[in-house]
C-alpha cells in the first residue's frame, strides 16, 4: 500500500496507470495543507479494497478536481 507513516504526505508513491472507473470503490481527495504541500488522490479499488495514490497532474484527475470544485462552489453556503 503506497501510504506513508509520516505525518506529512499520505502518499509515498504515485500510480500513473489510468484507473478504470468500473474498478473504483471510491476516490478520496486530500487537499494540500500545512502538512503536505500537494493535493493527494487516494483510490480505493473494489477488489480487495486495495488503495492506490493517483497522479493529480493526470488529465483525468484534473477533470475530476475541476468537477469537484465546481460542485463545491455550488453547494457552499
Amino acid at each position: 500500500v503506497p501510504l506513508s507513516r509520516t505525518v506529512r504526505c499520505t502518499c509515498i508513491s504515485i500510480s500513473n496507470q489510468p484507473v478504470n472507473p468500473r474498478s473504483l470503490e471510491k476516490l478520496e481527495i486530500i487537499p494540500a495543507s500545512q502538512f503536505c504541500p500537494r493535493v493527494e488522490i487516494i483510490a480505493t479499488m473494489k477488489k480487495k479494497g486495495e488503495k492506490r495514490c493517483l497522479n493529480p497532474e493526470s488529465k483525468a484527475i484534473k477533470n475530476l478536481l475541476k468537477a469537484v470544485s465546481k460542485e463545491r462552489s455550488k453547494r457552499s453556503p
Epitope: 484507473v19 481527495i29 483525468a60 477533470n63
Partner: antibody, heavy 134, light 110 residues
C-alpha cells in the same frame, strides 16, 4: 430537458466506415458514463461498450473489442461509436444511454469523496438505424 | 446465446399478476445488481427497475423487482394492455468485464 440524440445511421455498404454520434443535453455530460447498445432485427439487446468522458476511458464487450471504437468530446457533450469496416451482421438499431454517475459526498469537509454509482441506463436516445447492405 | 437466461415469452390477462425470471451466475447477478428494461414496440427501451428492486420516478408501483442468489425477478401486478412489450434483465459481469443482458421476454396481454 435531459436527453440524448443519436445521429449518423443509414444504409452503408459492407467494408465502409461509419461514425454514429450521441449528443447529450440537459445534464453534466462528464459526470456520467455513456453506453452504446444495439438491437439487431429479431434478436435481443446487446451491450457494445461505454465511455466515461471525465476519465476518457472506454470499456468494450469482448465481442466488440477491436471491432469498434467509442470516444467522447467533452467540449460538445457528444459520444461516438465508430467502425472502420462494417459487416452485414452490424445491421441493427443503435442506442446510446446514460449510465454510471459520479457522486461527490463530504464536499464541505476537508476530505471530499467521489463514488461512481451504476444505477442502470436511465436516459436513452431515440436510436439510429444502421443497415449494412450492398 | 445470452449470458442471462429469461423465458422467451409470457402472457396474462388484464388485472393478472405476471412474473418474469432472469437466471445468471456468481460472476454477474450473484455479485452485482439486476436492472430491468421495458421495450415497447417501436420505442427505445426504458429503465423499469434498478438496484434489484428500485423504481425510477414515473414508473408505476405495479412493477416490482427482486433478487435472490444468482436470479432476479420482475413482477407486474394488475396487468394492463399497455404492458405488452419486450422485457430485458441486465447486470454487470465481473468475468466478462461488461454489462450483460437476458435474451428478452415478450409479454402478451391476452
Amino acid at each position: 430537458q435531459v436527453q440524448l440524440v443519436e445521429s449518423g445511421g443509414g444504409v452503408v455498404q459492407p467494408g465502409r466506415s461509419l461514425r454514429l454520434s450521441c449528443a447529450a443535453s440537459g445534464f453534466t455530460f462528464s459526470s456520467f458514463s455513456i453506453t452504446w447498445i444495439r438491437d439487431p432485427p429479431g434478436k435481443g439487446l446487446e451491450w457494445i461498450g461505454e465511455i466515461t468522458p471525465m476519465f476518457g476511458i472506454a470499456n468494450y464487450a469482448q465481442k466488440f473489442q477491436g471491432q469498434v471504437t467509442i470516444s467522447a468530446d467533452k467540449s460538445i457533450s457528444t459520444a461516438y461509436l465508430q467502425w472502420s469496416s462494417l459487416k452485414a451482421s452490424d445491421t441493427a438499431m443503435y442506442y446510446c444511454a446514460r449510465d454510471g454517475r459520479f457522486d461527490v459526498s463530504d464536499l464541505l469537509t476537508d476530505k471530499p469523496k467521489v463514488t461512481i454509482n451504476y444505477n442502470g441506463m436511465d436516459v436513452w436516445g431515440q436510436g439510429t438505424l444502421v443497415t449494412v447492405s450492398s | 446465446q445470452s449470458v442471462l437466461t429469461q423465458p422467451p415469452s409470457a402472457s396474462g390477462t388484464p388485472g393478472q399478476r405476471v412474473t418474469i425470471s432472469c437466471s445468471g451466475s456468481s460472476s454477474n447477478i450473484g455479485s452485482n445488481t439486476v436492472n430491468w428494461y421495458q421495450e415497447l414496440p417501436g420505442a427505445a427501451p426504458q429503465l423499469l427497475i434498478y438496484n434489484n428492486d428500485q423504481r425510477p420516478s414515473g414508473i408505476p408501483d405495479r412493477f416490482s423487482g427482486s433478487k435472490s442468489g444468482t436470479s432476479g425477478s420482475l413482477v407486474i401486478s394488475g396487468l394492463q394492455s399497455e404492458d405488452e412489450a419486450d422485457y430485458y434483465c441486465a447486470s454487470w459481469d465481473d468475468s466478462l468485464n461488461g454489462r450483460v443482458f437476458g435474451g428478452g421476454t415478450k409479454l402478451t396481454v391476452l
